[in-house]
């Protein structure tokens, strides 16, 4: 269900390219390849190099992205590039530069004196957004979004972009300073696994982070399934740099039991979150539950 | 915290019925709930789980013909169909220990059981 | 289904001695499984969960162990009011759960 031809505009083309990068990624760290047959993944990195020489035409001369050249750039469509690209990055020959133009643009631009990155020209597609959406806690959420991106660029982008450690400094102390009164459990989740990236969800927030867990085994908002298994996802990522893994193997059930492959209206980012938490379980778990994930890698035909 | 189930009787086989599980204590909207019966002189068997949102897991041999749901934040039932006489048991509703999930966190407490007889 | 085997069906022990229950998975359930104590006419009561946790107010003789897919409870110095039947209840995934067939102890 994951190989798709990226095509269409600024938006829609991140929207095609998240499934094959996800799905590369997941296969790779958990070196399935031979069920599939090597060629496939060949063919799947080759639309990988369409989506990112596509995405290109709509980089802007700040080195942000939108979804029409002309438009006003995104705070979260540059950010979720960053993300893409880092993932991307030991797949692809990726230009630095792009990389970490579009994160120096996001320092220097979007992020406000305490930390927030605001967001100025939302993305025409929300559907692609997740739990973002009509999120009422959008300012804990975009950053903690913003913040996981940036960490994951840091190893590419540190020496090229002075301001990087300062910027993740400063939206740590504005989500640790917040993070007691949130009431979503997607914004616990979602802020809870960028704090842990930084080695500070402990004491009282951890405690919030783990409490917040509907029946130890999922992070749970009303309504749509999608979102919370998108925070679930980052709740388990959370969980694998906490090293909890007494916390882990009920997350992992749940997400597993949801028999959620990818694919379909809105999925971006469930798609991209329940992949990467998995995969990176597979990685770091020790004796780890194996996983029968339904991949599906048919690749279109030219 | 204490359960208490209902419900069960003398059925004839294919008679439905609906056994409930009240519990005191706490509230089932931030607990799980599992079912397990023991027919008399043998073993436990797992039938199924609820979660505190509703959803609800079985036991494969128990698809179908075994429905668990909340009725309220202190009732959970369990709706038996097509029973026959092997389906004659203690049933006990236990809650998962802690409020997680009852086959990894343990089952704790139980109630003491209902005793469902299928005979014609 | 055949997820756990028990072993064995019944064991005695004398007072202070030593009893041993295994469980064998049939495929590895990592720390799904909890091991239960009931009494006739009594329902359950929860022992051991995750393999080698002791549940709140289970005395500290009753010990959860695990290694590969074997799981062992062992109760050490033996007490008469540990005459039971002891189970185990291993998962491969929610649908895929069951008990082993219990061990009778009986104390001497």
């Known amino acids: 269900h994951l190989i798709v031809t990226p095509s269409g505009a600024g938006e829609q083309n991140m929207i095609g390219m998240t499934p094959t990068v996800i799905a590369v990624h997941y296969l790779d760290e958990t070196e399935q390849w031979e069920k599939f047959g090597l060629e496939k993944r060949q063919g799947a990195l080759e639309l990988i190099k369409k989506g990112y020489t596509q995405q290109l035409a709509f980089r802007q001369p700040s080195s942000a992205f939108a979804a029409f050249v002309k438009r006003a750039p995104s705070t979260w469509l540059t950010a979720y590039v960053v993300k893409v690209f880092s993932l991307a990055v030991n797949l692809i020959a990726i230009d630095s530069q792009v990389l970490c133009g579009a994160v120096k643009w996001l320092i220097l631009e979007k992020q406000k004196p305490d930390g927030v990155f605001q967001e100025d020209a939302p993305v025409i597609h929300q559907e692609m957004i997740g739990g973002l959406r009509n999120n009422n806690e959008k300012d804990m959420a975009l950053t903690a979004f913003v913040l996981i991106s940036l960490q994951e660029a840091k190893d590419i982008c540190e020496e090229q972009v002075n301001s990087l450690p300062g910027s993740i400094t400063k939206a740590g102390d504005f989500l640790e300073a917040n993070y007691m009164n949130l009431q979503r459990s997607y914004t616990v989740a979602i802020a809870g696994y960028a704090l842990a990236q930084m080695g500070r969800l402990k004491g009282p927030l951890l405690n919030k982070f783990l409490t917040t867990a509907k029946d130890k085994n999922r992070w749970e908002d009303p309504g749509k399934q999608l979102y919370n298994v998108e925070a679930t996802s980052y709740a388990l990522l959370a969980l694998l740099q906490l090293k909890d893994f007494d916390f882990v193997p009920p997350v992992v059930r749940w997400l597993n039991e949801q028999r959620y492959y990818g694919g379909g209206y809105g999925s971006t980012q469930a798609t991209f979150m329940v992949f990467q938490a998995l995969a990176q379980y597979q990685k770091d778990a020790p004796d780890h539950q194996e996983l029968n994930l339904d991949v599906s890698l048919q690749l279109p035909s030219r | 915290q204490s359960l208490e189930e209902s419900g069960g009787r003398l059925v004839t086989p294919g008679t439905p019925l609906t056994l409930t599980c009240t519990v005191s204590?706490?509230?089932?909207?931030?607990?799980?709930m599992a079912w397990v019966r023991q027919a008399p002189g043998k073993g436990l068997e797992y039938i199924g789980w609820?979660?505190?949102?509703?959803?609800t897991y079985y036991a494969s041999w128990a698809k179908g013909r075994f429905t668990i749901s909340k009725t309220s934040s202190t009732t959970v039932d369990l709706k038996m169909t097509s029973l026959t006489t092997e389906d004659t048991a203690t049933y006990f509703c236990?809650?998962?220990?802690?409020?997680?999930?009852?086959?990894?966190?343990?089952?704790?407490?139980w109630g003491p059981g209902t005793l469902v007889t299928v005979s014609s | 289904d055949g997820v756990m085997t028990q072993t064995p069906s019944s064991t005695s022990a004398a007072v202070g001695g030593t009893v041993t229950i295994k469980c064998q998975a049939s495929?590895?359930?990592?720390?799904?499984l909890s091991w239960y104590q009931q009494k006739p006419g009594q329902p359950p009561k929860l022992l051991i969960y995750?393999?080698?946790k002791l549940a709140s107010g289970v005395p500290s003789r009753f010990k959860g162990s695990r290694s590969g897919t074997e799981y062992t409870l062992a109760i050490s110095g033996v007490q008469r009011e540990d005459a039971a039947t002891y189970y185990c209840?291993?998962?491969?995934?929610?649908?895929?759960?069951?008990f082993g067939a219990g061990t009778n102890v009986e104390i001497k």
């Open positions: 609820i979660d505190s949102s509703g959803s």
């Open positions: 236990a809650s998962g220990n802690d409020g997680g999930d009852p086959l990894y966190y343990g089952m704790d407490p």
């Open positions: 209840l291993g998962s491969i995934a929610s649908d895929d759960t069951a």
């Open positions: 995750e393999a080698s």
């Open positions: 495929q590895s359930i990592r720390s799904w």
């Open positions: 204590g706490f509230s089932l909207s931030r607990y799980t």
